[in-house]
């Protein structure tokens, strides 16, 4: 059984940096394993080496540790449009990203989907597409922004937010999304 994180932190703080307290003998501090390795056996006693083994293929540790097992490498999720930027090594997890002219949208802290950057047809680029943010478009007169695309005011129904933007006007309409269609 792995002790709760707080207990492990408490135990580690008894030893100098780079060492951890022996689980069976709290008077002994063992050297932590380097990144890319994991703890196979605790050190037998003070001044003796910890038995660390290299992570097997498909697993990694990214920092010094006393883990009993390496962590499994992440897989890029093809169904979310993700591509592999760099493959997993013993000391670094897989890095996933998006293709050129796409951005990441995070549905949650650890799940993102790749979407094409908006081209701002019938408008102009107000802010360029970035790694984690779509292009921000400014629509030409006679168009309103819906789902980050500039749509003709002829498609504006009276019930929608666009009615404010599609009144006769001379100025460009900037980035107020039509909230009535999503």
């Amino acid at each position: 059984l792995v002790p709760p994180l707080r207990d492990r932190e408490k135990r580690d703080s008894v030893c100098p940096q780079g060492k951890y307290i022996h689980p069976q003998n709290n008077s002994v501090c063992c050297t932590k394993c380097h990144k890319g390795t994991y703890l196979y056996n605790d050190c037998p006693g003070p001044g003796q080496d910890t038995d660390c083994r290299e992570c097997e293929s498909g697993s990694f540790t990214a920092s010094e540790n006393h883990l009993r097992h390496c962590l499994s490498c992440s897989k890029c999720r093809k169904e979310m449009g993700q591509v592999e930027i760099s493959s997993c090594t013993v000391d670094r997890d897989t890095v996933c990203g998006c293709r050129k002219n796409q951005y990441r949208y995070y549905w949650s802290e650890n799940l993102f989907q790749c979407f094409n950057c908006s081209l701002c047809l019938n408008g102009t680029v107000h802010l360029s597409c970035q790694e984690k943010q779509n292009t921000v478009c400014t629509c030409h007169a006679g168009f309103f922004l819906r789902e980050n695309e500039c749509v003709s005011c002829s498609n504006c129904k009276k019930t929608l937010e666009c009615t404010k933007l599609c009144l006769p006007q001379t100025e460009n309409v900037k980035g107020t999304e039509d909230s009535g269609t999503t």
Epitope: K75, R77, K78, E79, M80, Y105, W107, Q113, F115, N116, N134, E147, N148, T182
Partner: nanobody, 119 residues
């Protein structure tokens, strides 16, 4: 016309189980990645799980990993969510949806089914 109809929600005690179903029509179900999302009272949408077209390598949110199982039957155009070891914090309206393609919004999703976990 795309239709997604969820069922199987209800009142269950903590530790109990429920199986949600989502009957799909109006599109080629077997060609789409399908998603379960939920909305707890007074909160935003939370991604629960998704499953690709062939039902391999499902994704689960950390909050449901090991307790929920997503599956699909392409011959029946139906998506499922088996929910075990239910907790009070799983109380929410559960929606099934088609994975978006054009942008981060759901074009197609159901009306939802309410799951209440309470003793």
């Amino acid at each position: 016309e795309v239709q997604l109809l969820e069922s199987g929600g209800g009142l269950v005690q903590p530790g109990g189980s429920l199986r949600l179903s989502c009957a799909a029509s109006g599109f080629t179900f077997a060609h789409e990645t399908m998603v379960w999302v939920r909305q707890a009272p007074g909160k935003g949408l939370e991604w629960v799980s998704h499953i690709d077209r062939v039902g391999q390598d499902p994704y689960y949110a950390d909050s449901v990993e090991g307790r929920f199982t997503i599956s699909r039957d392409n011959s029946k155009n139906t998506l499922y969510l088996q929910m075990n070891s239910l907790r009070a914090e799983d109380t929410a309206v559960y929606y099934c949806a088609v994975l978006p393609k054009r942008g981060p919004w759901f074009d197609y999703w159901g009306q939802g089914t309410l799951v209440t976990v309470s003793s």
